[in-house]
């Protein structure tokens, strides 16, 4: 449906407020450095120009692209080669290659200062005398930190924002109702940009087919009931919707996101049993609430798998006809029985089923060379289910603090030469897996805790990426999408490594750890414990706890101190020369 | 839009031989598979033969197996059905065919076809 003006067509389906907030997302996501008032110049005078090609589609330069008339704004500023240096060169091109090395710039790690939380009474004062400006600058600060977060959901994310301080700065504890709000919006928002960012590292690693065959996979255990034509119809439109949200194409991303959650919604009855609620809510909670839909109860009597893809004569004919679309029947068939299943299990059995077709087909006798494919399946199953198994039980008797320090000797040692930061950052959130799924029961450990680690290890990936050190993370993070965490699991100690220098200073600590919370704690000493282990990979578990032990004392006992610097400066040097005799440094 | 043009069907005697082509667009041919079905007359559509889009897997129907040959060029965009030893049953007009998005596989009435070319097989 061609458009005269496309500018105007997504201003008139998406409402200026929408627009407006969906174009300052664009923007802050394409020029991180730039300060917030900037932003807002831009943002007014695109919606200016939206507004004459609404009043006049025929208007000039109405009909030009939208990624023309934002690229052309985004290269008015003035310091553009100052602040982001050959991001300028973007410039001196023509779309859609403009777009694409816009595209490329887009900083997962971006330099910027943490977001101190300030008092809740001047939060709610900010709020009061502007909340336009207030609300604006929350889908700033987290659209620049997070450049691939999902647009539509972080409206979504600025509607609850919005809800806890009209409801909080009214109340009589304002702090006791509005920080646990934050806290939450805060620890989700983050989940839902790891989300985000591994579905476009899907797309734009590994291509279009193998997102497909990931929401193949979800949205047939989500909706078992539903027909394959159905989810693929479904899987089509989701793909879609990504691919503009991952490619900067915002507003086309939202108004899509819209129409396939009223196309759900309309066709409700054959598509899935749970989404009544949902389907009741207003658009951005009802998008919400599709994406989050709990899984559908399987059809009663569904027939064995074998009878279509092992037993039939037509195997070979049907897979040669249509690989992709026989491939998907087996994704989809094997998908609705197994809700027990992590997607990216599914995924390998899928891999697997392709391979051996492809060399069972072009043999002289190929239903003797295929009868048994799904017996391959048993150890490709069997090895996530172990290891979920051990890693809950040591969690379990860890604790979490514990159990992510035991992943941080483990990844350190794996890949000693990733900056600790993102050492750090990775095995908390790895660590995390525990109180997150080893609570579920059996069925949803394994779809809880593998899909999860998917989305943590591709952090990992993308940071690496940034700032390539280590080829073993490259190796794991490129060969296959779906073997990533089998890869990263399978890495033993890292022999070629030589030990870091040992440097005082790294291990030197101050009266201001005593101020920290407890959380922020936590990473000084996590972030001295892979210290640790990069100057003594050798380091046995027993060392490294003695080690981490007297650290521990040192901070609690130098924290008491009436004079806590001289404290941790005389102690600090005592601590050290006995960590390094312990660890024979 | 999808195109295919089969040509090269005529008159021939049992034990003969014929080679059809199938020329095709609008598609991208190097990624699809390709199938012969034919209609005999007063009969329903069968299958004949499969070729998968890189031709490493070909498969054929009972009937046909190890008189017919089925190939294809994916620089020319074409696929191929040599026909040796011909028989009178094997008189039908025969349909190059590919696989139709949203179709069943194997429900070769929603593939894509052309118009087809006849084959007839008589002393």
């Known amino acids: 449906d061609a458009h005269k003006s496309e500018v105007a067509h997504r201003f008139k389906d998406l409402g200026e407020e929408n627009f407006k907030a969906l174009v300052l997302i664009a923007f802050a996501q394409y020029l991180q450095q730039c300060p917030f008032e900037d932003h807002v110049k831009l943002v007014n005078e695109v919606t200016e120009f939206a507004k004459t090609c609404v009043a006049d589609e025929s208007a000039e330069n109405c009909d030009k692209s939208l990624h023309t008339l934002f690229g052309d704004k985004l290269c008015t500023v003035a310091t553009l080669r100052e602040t982001y240096g050959e991001m300028a060169d973007c410039c001196a091109k023509q779309e859609p290659e403009r777009n694409e090395c816009f595209l490329q710039h887009k900083d997962d790690n971006p330099n910027l200062p943490r977001l101190v939380r300030p008092e809740v009474d001047v939060m709610c004062t900010a709020f009061h005398d502007n909340e336009e400006t207030f609300l604006k600058k929350y889908l700033y600060e987290i659209a620049r930190r997070h450049p691939y977060f999902y647009a539509p959901e972080l409206l979504f994310f600025a509607k609850r924002y919005k809800a806890a301080f009209t409801e909080c700065c009214q109340a009589a504890d304002k702090a006791a109702c509005l920080l646990p709000k934050l806290d939450e919006l805060r620890d989700e928002g983050k989940a839902s940009s790891a989300k985000q960012r591994l579905k476009c590292a899907s797309l734009q690693k590994f291509g279009e087919r193998a997102f497909k065959a990931w929401a193949v996979a979800r949205l047939s255990q989500r909706f078992p009931k539903a027909e394959f034509a159905e989810v693929s119809k479904l899987v089509t439109d989701l793909t879609k919707v990504h691919t503009e949200c991952c490619h900067g194409d915002l507003l086309e991303c939202a108004d899509d996101r819209a129409d396939l959650a009223k196309y759900i919604c309309e066709n409700q009855d054959s598509i899935s049993s749970k989404l009544k609620e949902c389907c009741e809510k207003p658009l951005l909670e009802k998008s919400h609430c599709i994406a989050e839909v709990e899984n559908d109860e399987m059809p009663a009597d569904l027939p064995s798998l074998a009878a279509d893809f092992v037993e039939s004569k037509d195997v070979c004919k049907n897979y040669a006809e249509a690989k992709d679309v026989f491939l998907g029947m087996f994704l989809y068939e094997y998908a609705r029985r197994h809700p027990d299943y992590s997607v990216v299990l599914l995924l390998r059995l899928a891999k697997t089923y392709e391979t051996t077709l492809e060399k069972c087909c072009a043999a002289a006798d190929p239903h003797e060379c295929y009868a048994k494919v799904f017996d391959e399946f048993k150890p490709l199953v069997e090895e996530p289910q172990n290891l979920i198994k051990q890693n809950c039980e040591l969690f379990e008797q860890l604790g979490e603090y514990k159990f992510q320090n035991a992943l941080l000797v483990r990844y350190t040692k794996k890949v000693p030469q990733v900056s600790t930061p993102t050492l750090v950052e990775v095995s908390r959130n790895l660590g995390k897996v525990g109180s997150k799924c080893c609570k579920h029961p059996e069925a949803k450990r394994m779809p809880c805790a593998e899909d999860y680690l998917s989305v943590v290890l591709n952090q990992l990936c993308v940071l690496h990426e940034k700032t390539p050190v280590s080829d073993r993370v490259t190796k794991c993070c490129t060969e296959s999408l779906v073997n990533r965490r089998p890869c990263f699991s399978a890495l033993e100690v890292d022999e070629t490594y030589v030990p870091k220098e040992f440097n005082a200073e790294t291990f030197t600590f101050h009266a201001d750890i005593c101020t920290l919370s407890e959380k922020e704690r936590q990473i000084k000493k996590q972030t001295a414990l892979v210290e640790l282990v990069k100057h003594k990979p050798k380091a046995t578990k027993e060392q490294l706890k003695a080690v981490m032990d007297d650290f521990a004392a040192f901070v609690e006992k130098c924290c008491k101190a009436d004079d806590k610097e001289t404290c941790f400066a005389e102690e600090g040097k005592k601590l050290v020369a006995a960590s390094q005799a312990a660890l024979g440094l | 839009e999808v195109q295919l043009v089969e040509s090269g069907g005529g008159e021939v005697q049992p034990g003969g031989s014929l080679r059809l082509s199938c020329a095709a667009s609008g598609f991208t041919f190097s990624t699809s598979g390709m199938v012969w079905v034919r209609q005999a007359p007063g009969k329903g559509l069968e299958w004949v033969s499969t070729i998968s889009d890189d031709a490493r897997i070909t498969v054929y129907a009972e009937s046909v197996k190890g008189r017919f040959t089925i190939s294809r060029d994916n620089a020319k965009n074409t696929v191929y059905l040599q026909m040796n030893s011909l028989r009178a049953e094997d008189t039908a007009v025969y349909y190059c065919?590919?696989?139709?998005?949203?179709?069943?596989?194997?429900?070769?009435?929603?593939?894509?076809r052309g118009q087809g070319t006849l084959v007839t097989v008589k002393p």
């Open positions: 065919a590919t696989y139709r998005a949203g179709s069943r596989i194997g429900s070769y009435e929603d593939y894509y």
